[in-house]
Interface confidence: medium
Amino acid sequence: LPAQVAFTPYAPEPGSTCRLREYYDQTAQMCCSKCSPGQHAKVFCTKTSDTVCDSCEDSTYTQLWNWVPECLSCGSRCSSDQVETQACTREQNRICTCRPGWYCALSKQEGCRLCAPLRKCRPGFGVARPGTETSDVVCKPCAPGTFSNTTSSTDICRPHQICNVVAIPGNASMDAVCTSTSPTRSMAPGAVHLPQPVSTRSQHTQPTPEPSTAPSTSFLLPMGPSPPAEGSTGD
């Protein structure tokens, strides 16, 4: 005979665990149904009645199967200088990210408390290490034979073009200038860019019995003037 399928609530066999999407209620001492993402437990189960679930209210969510008595609040509204990359729904938290060209400089579990502009490398300096969602750009002086003529958080030092006859030698901040005869080799026109960091951090981890992989949201602090770009004094 096939084994009977137990309907929640039911008492588990000694030493066994409840099934997927069920939880053991200590008070009722029964296996009971969890609530689906977007819902929460309105009434906990008893020995004779299963969990009663209800939808999360506006601005609240649950991301996992759960039996929490109330849904989690979505994080603070994104500031005007942030980008909302994921809206608050009944099943997911809002995700705010620092705007392009900025990175998170001061974070807490709730997310980023301070977004700061990525450092710009001045002419004569190129990007040695690109910015990430949590670290600033590192600039380095252009080595002999290379140059950068831009103020940029993405441009690296590029080789000078090779001339048959040099009109003006290149330096750290300027390409070589060739005489009217075409150069032997030159870089493709335009600067070489490094990719911008992409921030994909979401807001709060969810305190439920199942592990949550939700990372944390970026909040933006209104900033004063940007810090000076690195490179003019070589510091």
Epitope: S73, S76, R77, Q109, E110, L114, L221, M223
Partner: antibody, heavy 120, light 111 residues
Framework: QVQLVQSGAEVKKPGASVKVSCKAS????????IDWVRQATGQGLEWIGE????????YYNEKFKGRATLTANKSISTAYMELSSLRSEDTAVYFC?????????????WGQGTLVTVSS | DIVMTQSPDSLAVSLGERATINCRAS??????????MHWYQQKPGQPPKLLIY???NLESGVPDRFSGSGARTDFTLTISSLQAEDVAVYYC?????????FGQGTKVEIK
């Protein structure tokens, strides 16, 4: 306008616990941190910890870890600070304060304070 | 923990004169061009009141005779022209990292 209203004065015996409440109004309670700071008579300010009511996440000064418990009830916009195993040196005024998640990152509105006296 | 040290402990200044309070942090409280240093005023029997946030920003409703300056580890609160209602204890505080810490306070009185 933002207001934080704290519960009344308490007198406790050494070893007991005290729970101070802080009711917030005038802003979205779940959007900002509630910090707790204490001040012994004639002394300076000492940070106990903070809670983010939106998620229940807490941050404690190591000095108070294990003795202080910060909680929040979102439905009534009220934060709580419970301090256990009280000793005479815990006699102080306890303040709650709001700290915005982003913006000032400072405590811009404070409760009126709650005097907790620990005496046998 | 970041230790905040204020100087002087007390200060007596004539009405209309300048009052200057210093605060030194045991390590930098700066991050990406922002100083996470704040100044509070506390009068007897009252909670502290935020005067200056992030080193130099005047809190709404605070008279502009109050100003803040400094970066990294050294900060100053200045009252350009002391008024009778400015008699209070002033505290600096850092919020760069947990635990947030306060200076020991500077008492300002009328000379």
């Amino acid at each position: 306008q933002v207001q934080l209203v704290q519960s009344g004065a308490e007198v406790k015996k050494p070893g007991a616990s005290v729970k101070v409440s802080c009711k917030a109004s005038g802003y979205t309670f779940t959007d900002d941190y509630i910090d707790w700071v204490r001040q012994a008579t004639g002394q300076g300010l000492e940070w106990i910890g903070e809670i983010y009511p939106g998620s229940g996440n807490t941050y404690y000064n190591e000095k108070f870890k294990g003795r202080a418990t910060l909680t929040a009830n979102k439905s009534i916009s009220t934060a709580y600070m419970e301090l256990s195993s009280l000793r005479s040196e815990d006699t102080a005024v306890y303040f709650c304060a709001r700290s915005q998640v982003y913006g000032k990152i400072a405590m811009d509105h404070w409760g009126q304070g709650t005097l907790v006296t620990v005496s046998s | 923990d970041i230790v905040m040290t204020q100087s002087p402990d007390s200060l007596a200044v004539s009405l209309g004169e300048r009052a200057t309070i210093n605060c030194r942090a045991s390590e930098s409280v700066d991050n990406s061009g922002n100083s996470f240093m704040h100044w509070y005023q506390q009068k007897p029997g009252q909670p502290p009141k935020l005067l200056i946030y992030r080193a130099s920003n005047l809190e709404s409703g605070v008279p502009d005779r109050f100003s803040g300056s400094g970066a990294r580890t050294d900060f100053t609160l200045t009252i350009s022209s002391l008024q009778a209602e400015d008699v209070a204890v002033y505290y600096c505080q850092q919020s760069k990292e947990d635990p947030y810490t306060f200076g020991q306070g500077t008492k300002v009185e009328i000379k």
